[in-house]
């Protein structure tokens, strides 16, 4: 089970279904920015591979003071089986390139629907 | 109370390209998933796909080349285009709700019947 | 894609008679299944979702069961209205999958 209760969802859901809402709020994001995303704020690049949800959650953490991405880590935090706390990396980030926050979450969007269309939920 | 209302030409020459809209009352487009699925005479269902809120698309992989689902949310529609039809795409074709962190279909139109015939 | 495999395809039943149609999934979907009930040139209607809950307004003669791979609809006390049609439905991966039914005859 995908368990997002207490997060965003209701309760658990499945993982098409957590990925799904996953990706429409990051369409949300890319489609309402105005000015810079987070006051264009910069993040550690990741590798889109496997466990790039918590690397994605340690990466966005340490962005503070931005409500436009506050849901989109609190869905994260559903994906991650660990507990993850700003200052925190893995091996999946790319230590030496910083990109904007902006491009952070068009580069994971644009991941994240290739799995979905090619079903890869978990 | 959300309403769904499929309509359409009922017959479509093969090869052609079958045009469907399904009129939403009662509820906006611009709020959870909203579907296309189909059947068959005499048969089981089929998932096609679905448009969000967002204008998000997702199509089923085997119908894939053939389809585009869009919308229109000044008239609160959503529209399926199948192209280059052929009879094994004469159905009953229906659009359903989805609400936004669910998987299952809580509401259904009607139907349209499509037969694809020379 | 996930298979969904019904069973029986059709049955003959009396009024008052207790039916159980049962829904074979290909791959473990959790309680990711829900069913519906159809009526001859009528759209599906929503029965039971998450394999157990029923939807607002289903009377509680139907009920579900199961997860993982197996699943049961069950129609405690059969009733005039409930000759129809019934399909289950898997909710754990896309494409959504349905199977391919149940007809539910009058004896």
């Known amino acids: 089970l995908t368990c997002l209760g207490g997060f965003a969802s209701p309760g658990p859901v499945p993982p098409s279904t957590a990925l799904r809402e996953l990706i429409e709020e990051l369409v949300n994001i890319t489609q309402n920015q105005k000015a810079p995303l987070c006051n264009g704020s910069m993040v550690w690049s990741i590798n889109l591979t496997a466990g790039m949800y918590c690397a994605a959650l340690e990466s966005l953490i340490n962005v503070s003071g931005c409500s436009a991405i506050e849901k989109t880590q609190r869905m994260l935090s559903g994906f991650c089986p660990h507990k993850v706390s700003a200052g925190q990396f893995s091996s999946l980030h790319v230590r030496d390139t910083k990109i904007e926050v902006a491009q952070f979450v068009k580069d994971l969007l644009l991941h994240l629907k290739k799995l979905f269309r090619e079903g890869q939920f978990n | 109370e959300v309403q769904l209302q499929e309509s359409g030409p009922g017959l479509v020459k093969p090869s052609e390209t079958l045009s469907l809209t399904c009129t939403v009352s009662g509820g906006s487009i611009s709020s959870d998933y909203w579907n296309w699925i189909r059947q068959p005479p005499g048969k089981g269902l089929e998932y096609i796909g679905y448009i969000s809120y967002n204008g998000n698309t997702y199509y089923n992989p085997s119908l894939k080349s053939q389809i585009t689902i869009s919308r229109d949310t000044s008239k609160n529609q959503l529209s399926l285009k199948l192209s280059s039809v052929t009879a094994a795409d004469t159905a009953v074709y229906y659009c359903?709700?989805?609400?936004?962190?669910?998987?299952?279909?809580?509401?259904w139109g009607q139907g349209t019947t499509v037969t694809v015939s020379s | 894609d996930i298979q969904m495999t019904q069973s029986p395809s059709s049955l003959s039943a009396s009024v008052g008679d207790r039916v159980t149609i049962t829904c074979h999934a290909s791959?473990?979907?959790?309680?990711?299944l829900s069913w519906y009930q159809q009526k001859p040139g009528k759209a599906p209607k929503l029965l039971i979702y998450?394999?157990?809950d029923l939807h607002t307004g289903v009377p509680s003669r139907f009920s579900g069961s199961g997860s993982g791979t197996d699943f049961t609809l069950t129609i405690s006390s059969l009733q005039p209205e409930d000759f129809a049609t019934y399909y289950c439905q898997q909710g754990q991966s896309y494409p959504y999958t349905f199977g391919g039914g149940t007809k539910v005859e009058i004896k």
């Open positions: 791959q473990n979907i959790n309680v990711w």
């Open positions: 359903a709700r989805l609400a936004k962190w669910t998987w299952y279909f809580d509401i």
């Open positions: 998450k394999a157990s």
